[in-house]
């Protein structure tokens, strides 16, 4: 999917909102240093392509993300702004029912959900050059 | 403007199934959550699950103990909830509730049906 | 599962009062996770409060929402008669979602 098209001020208000104390519930008694920083994006399009993959992909050791109320909120977000989005995800999402077993936050997933936490900062500050 | 008309009245015997609906239009069905949430009489509201429209993907309330299903029909912009193996205590008014992201973006149930009342009875 | 539990359940008020109604969560949520809703008899449920203290469009200035952590009120300045109604508190911060079991507030 291309991300161009979003409405990326609603986009970041929503997270700003309610997203980001999700992503905060979820790493509640995990350090803010615990984990580096490996995934990065360059402009708003480009991090909503990361942060899309990163929340509904499944991975290796974290296949459970997507059914966490940080991922539904940003489907959902998606979705309504961004035109066509819920039309494209059909493939995925059988995709990512066969990969969902059970909940369990793994360390893994913990990790992911810092390298999400960062790309979403990254979205809010799209003007700041490239580290 | 945003509408969620369900169907009607049901009366129902133990041990069957009710599948009720929900309607939705003025907006992009698609692309919101839609939200099933139960009151028996008297009682409060008890959320049964979800379902994206756009893709399937559902979220079911375990209490229910796999008895309901959440489906969703794209070209009627209709969704569905079925529940089997009613009993008594399954007698309530169920309702749709979208969900969205309000003028301050906080999420929460924005528009619901009128409710669909459902009675099981032998 | 969070639990909300809301009280008094039963509140009776006389015209221009103030009222105020509680929730108390079972766990630690995000203030823009807590909701209310209206419920009159007969009627569906209208959302009234979001994110613990943002007025629903339309709803009166005399209604305010506070709180943080666990602990959530609703206050009603000076009752009017249409303001008589069952308010429920909701979460959304964890699956499954849950409701409070409602404060029914009522002409004394």
């Known amino acids: 999917y291309d991300f161009t098209n979003c409405d990326f001020e609603k986009i970041k208000a929503a997270y700003l909102s309610t997203i980001s104390k999700d992503l905060i519930t979820y790493m509640s008694g995990t350090k803010s240093t615990e984990f580096n920083n490996t995934v990065s994006c360059s402009n708003r399009p480009h991090c909503l392509t990361e942060i899309q993959s990163l929340t509904f992909n499944p991975t290796a050791g974290c296949a459970s993300l997507a059914k966490e109320m940080f991922a539904m909120k940003t489907k959902a977000a998606l979705a309504i702004w961004c035109p066509g989005y819920s039309e494209t995800q059909i493939n995925a999402t059988q995709a990512m029912k066969k990969a969902r077993k059970s909940k369990v936050t793994t360390n893994k997933c913990l990790e992911q959900v810092s390298q999400l936490q960062g790309l979403w900062r990254r979205f809010n500050r799209p003007l700041l050059k490239q580290q | 403007q945003v509408q969620l008309v369900q169907s009607g009245a049901e009366v129902k015997k133990p041990g069957s199934s009710v599948k009720v609906s929900c309607k939705s239009s003025g907006y992009a069905f698609s692309s919101y959550w839609i939200n099933w949430v139960r009151q028996a009489p008297g009682q409060g509201l008890e959320w049964m699950g979800q379902i994206f429209p756009g893709d399937g993907d559902t979220t079911y309330n375990g209490n229910f103990k796999g008895r309901v299903t959440i489906t969703a029909d794209k070209s009627t912009s209709t969704a569905y909830m079925e529940l089997s193996s009613l009993r008594s205590e399954d007698t309530a008014v169920y309702y749709c509730a979208r969900s969205g992201f309000d003028y301050g973006y906080f999420y929460a149930m924005d528009y619901w049906g009128q409710g669909t009342t459902v009675t099981v009875s032998s | 599962e969070i639990v909300m539990t809301q009280s008094p359940a039963t509140l009776s008020v006389s015209p221009g009062e103030r009222a105020t109604l509680s929730c108390s969560v079972s766990?630690?949520?995000?203030?823009?996770?807590l909701h209310w809703y209206q419920q009159k008899p007969g009627q569906s449920p209208r959302p009234w409060i979001f994110g613990t203290s943002n007025l629903a469009s339309g709803i009166p200035a005399r209604f305010s929402g506070s709180g943080s952590g666990t602990e959530f009120t609703l206050t009603i300045s000076s009752l009017q008669s249409e303001d008589f109604a069952v308010y429920y508190c909701?979460?959304?911060?964890?699956?499954?979602?849950?409701f409070g079991g409602g404060t029914k507030v009522e002409i004394k």
């Open positions: 766990s630690s949520i995000s203030s823009s996770n």
């Open positions: 909701q979460q959304w911060s964890s699956y499954p979602l849950t």
